[in-house]
């Protein structure tokens, strides 16, 4: 099962990554 | 499981409109985007647009400014695709697909492909 | 634009023997921030919906074969296979996120 660290809750939508600055990276918790 | 299930093939007139519905489940809707991308018969993967859930934002490919339209309910988890004044060259199989927006930007789950025929 | 340019379009391949697709965009795709490369390689068989490979240039998605190597940075990128198995056939294609969405043209990759 794939999770996230964080959430996309505080994220613009931004049209792309060339933008983000921050990464919310997966976590393997299986 | 994550799984992104399309509307049935529709055949249109030239000049009139479609709209391809896509239901996700096994996953939040919202922390997602959704992306829409088509392939007209024999040709290669052409982006349309997207729309991000939980505010509703969209960005769209220039091409298809003003002719496509897309949305999403977040009742429903499903998220909706519309093409305005069809043309014979609309005639492709249109795919949603989930963008692992935030992260990657890429398309980890994709639904069955929705198979829009225009022809008079 | 940011346009993507796949070579070569069609790979006649010998099963167990490496294959090379070279992908290159217009500008680059590297987010100096993050440090990551925002281009992603999808694979679609015969019949099927597109399936995710790569992303971020070189990160194997979830349960994708070994086999499976993404490499480059900036403009130009390469996925490998080491040897070529039956399964591999269809077209493979790499799309920028960097700023919207772009595919190349797709590579036909056939069993000689």
């Known amino acids: 099962v794939k999770s996230k660290i964080g959430s996309t809750e505080n994220l613009k939508h931004q049209p792309g990554g060339g933008k983000v600055q921050i990464i919310n990276k997966k976590l393997d918790l299986s | 499981q994550v799984q992104l299930v399309q509307s049935g093939a529709e055949v249109k007139k030239p000049g009139s409109s479609v709209k391809v519905s896509c239901k996700a489940s096994?996953?939040?809707?919202?922390?997602?985007?959704i992306s829409w991308v088509r392939q007209a018969p024999g040709q290669g993967l052409e982006w349309m647009g997207e729309?991000?859930?939980?505010?509703?934002?969209?960005y769209y490919n220039e091409k298809f400014k003003g002719r496509v339209t897309i949305t999403a309910d977040k009742s429903t988890s499903t998220a909706y695709m519309e093409l305005s004044s069809l043309r014979s060259e609309d005639t492709a199989v249109y795919y949603c697909?989930?963008?692992?927006?935030?992260?990657?930007?890429?398309?980890?789950?994709w639904g069955q492909g929705t198979l829009v025929t225009v022809s008079s | 634009d940011i346009v993507m340019s796949q070579s070569p379009l069609s790979l006649p391949v010998t099963p167990g023997e490496p294959a090379s697709i070279s992908c290159k965009s217009s500008?680059?795709?590297?987010?100096?921030?993050?440090?990551?490369?925002?281009l992603a390689w999808y694979l679609q068989k015969p019949g099927q919906s597109p399936q995710l490979l790569i992303y971020?240039?070189?990160t194997r998605e979830s349960g994708v074969p070994d086999r499976f190597t993404g490499s480059g940075s900036g403009t130009d990128f390469t996925l490998k296979i080491s040897r070529v198995e039956a399964e591999d056939v269809g077209v493979y294609y790499c799309?920028?996120?960097?700023?919207?969405?772009?595919f190349g043209q797709g590579t036909k990759v056939e069993i000689k």
């Open positions: 697909a989930r963008d692992y927006y935030g992260t990657s930007f890429a398309m980890d789950y």
């Open positions: 096994g996953y939040t809707f919202s922390d997602y985007v």
């Open positions: 729309i991000f859930p939980r505010s509703g934002s969209t």
């Open positions: 500008q680059s795709l590297l987010n100096s921030r993050t440090r990551k490369n925002y």
């Open positions: 971020w240039a070189s």
């Open positions: 799309k920028q996120s960097f700023y919207l969405r772009t």
